[in-house]
Interface confidence: low
């Protein structure tokens, strides 16, 4: 169990580290996103894991982004952002079978409503009751 | 612009106290971890402390008990409590930005420092 | 707690050379580690995060590997901007927080 947690681990690094860079492989980001999602939780151990990756670095100050998988929908009032931004991306992650042909990031304001806790615990959990 | 500044050092008596504060600016102090980071005059660097985004604060072992951490998100500012002051603690103090990386973390944002020197 | 141990702890080279220095934990701490480049006066500037990736910005003749206890900095040709002290920091956030930096590597003009 621990050499299967550790090439888990191996594999989300890599699909963090390459989020977004070709558009045409996209299928273990979908997965990613879909395991954020359901499991509501961003990145692997923090969501600040998002803070380096290359696709999703802007050009402001403060150009901090995450996939939108990462947002927390019950917890965001601000319905602008909730009907232009965030469900048109996540309505693709209700369902298992979706095409997608760019990265669906998302910036993170100053008072995000992003999950807070990385996937790692709850994966785990998972890979210890399956 | 991103940046740290801190302010506060001084002369001190041993056994005195000080505060240091850090204010950051072009950024939410609250998004982040934060940390002191001293170097004592010719030497290396040392860690201090470190306050993560949820407020948990953490020391290095000899820093426990006369040095504490803390923030005011509101004023967007880092602050660095230090009692019991000895003159081993005289160094130049630094406000750092840390970022975590898959369990790591590292410094990416540095004030200019503020230097403490505690001397009768 | 875990010990950072940096050598060589100066280092002459000149402009053009391939500068190589080491920093070993004490202890495993996987790839935790940072590397970091201070100038007489100035504060630290981060060179290279989780033992070999370049932040934005740090050119690309800086290059860090390694991991678990053994790590290196290398230089592939010194630039008159690289003369500095380089310190390792290992930052492993793990179940109890670590942080710790190595003595530090002066490299000075030859």
């Known amino acids: 169990r621990a050499q299967l947690e550790r090439s888990l681990r191996d594999v989300v690094e890599k699909t963090i580290q390459k989020y977004g860079t070709n558009p045409e492989e996209t299928a273990a980001e979908e997965s990613w996103d879909y395991v954020q999602f359901q499991l509501r939780c961003c990145g692997w151990h923090y969501p600040q894991d998002w803070f380096q990756v290359l696709i999703l670095r802007g050009n402001g100050s403060e150009a901090h982004r995450v996939p939108c998988s990462c947002y927390n929908l019950s917890a965001t009032n601000d319905s602008t952002i909730l009907d232009k931004v965030i469900l048109p991306q996540l309505s693709r992650l209700g369902h298992l079978a979706r095409s997608r042909h760019s990265a669906d990031i998302c910036a993170v304001p100053a008072e995000s409503h992003i999950y807070r806790e990385g996937c790692a615990q709850g994966l785990q959990k998972w890979l210890h009751n399956n | 612009e991103v940046q740290l500044v801190e302010s506060g050092g001084g002369l001190v008596q041993p056994g005195g106290s000080l505060r240091l504060s850090c204010a950051a600016s072009g950024f939410s102090l609250s998004n982040y971890n934060m940390g002191w980071v001293r170097q004592a005059p010719g030497k290396g660097l040392e860690w201090v402390s470190v306050?993560?985004?949820?407020?948990?604060?953490y020391y290095a072992t000899w820093a426990k008990g006369r040095f504490t951490i803390s923030r005011d998100n509101s004023k967007n500012t880092l602050y660095l409590q230090m009692n019991s002051l000895r003159a081993e603690d005289t160094a130049t103090y630094y406000c750092a930005r840390e970022l975590l990386y898959f369990g790591s973390s590292y410094y990416d944002l540095w004030g200019q420092g503020t230097l403490v020197t505690v001397s009768s | 707690d875990v010990v950072m141990t940096q050598s060589p702890s100066t280092l002459s080279a000149s402009v053009g050379d391939r500068v190589t220095i080491t920093c070993q934990a004490s202890q495993n701490i996987d790839s935790n580690l940072a590397w970091y480049q201070q100038k007489p006066g100035k504060a630290p500037k981060f060179l290279i995060y989780?033992?070999?990736n370049l932040p934005f910005g740090v050119p690309s003749r800086f290059k860090g590997s390694g991991s678990g206890t053994e790590f290196t900095l290398t230089i592939s040709s010194l630039q008159p901007d690289d003369f500095a002290t380089y310190y390792c920091q290992c930052a492993d956030v793990g179940s109890t927080y670590v942080a710790a930096f190595g003595g530090g590597t002066k490299v000075e003009i030859k």
């Open positions: 989780y033992a070999s």
């Open positions: 306050i993560d985004a949820s407020g948990t604060t």
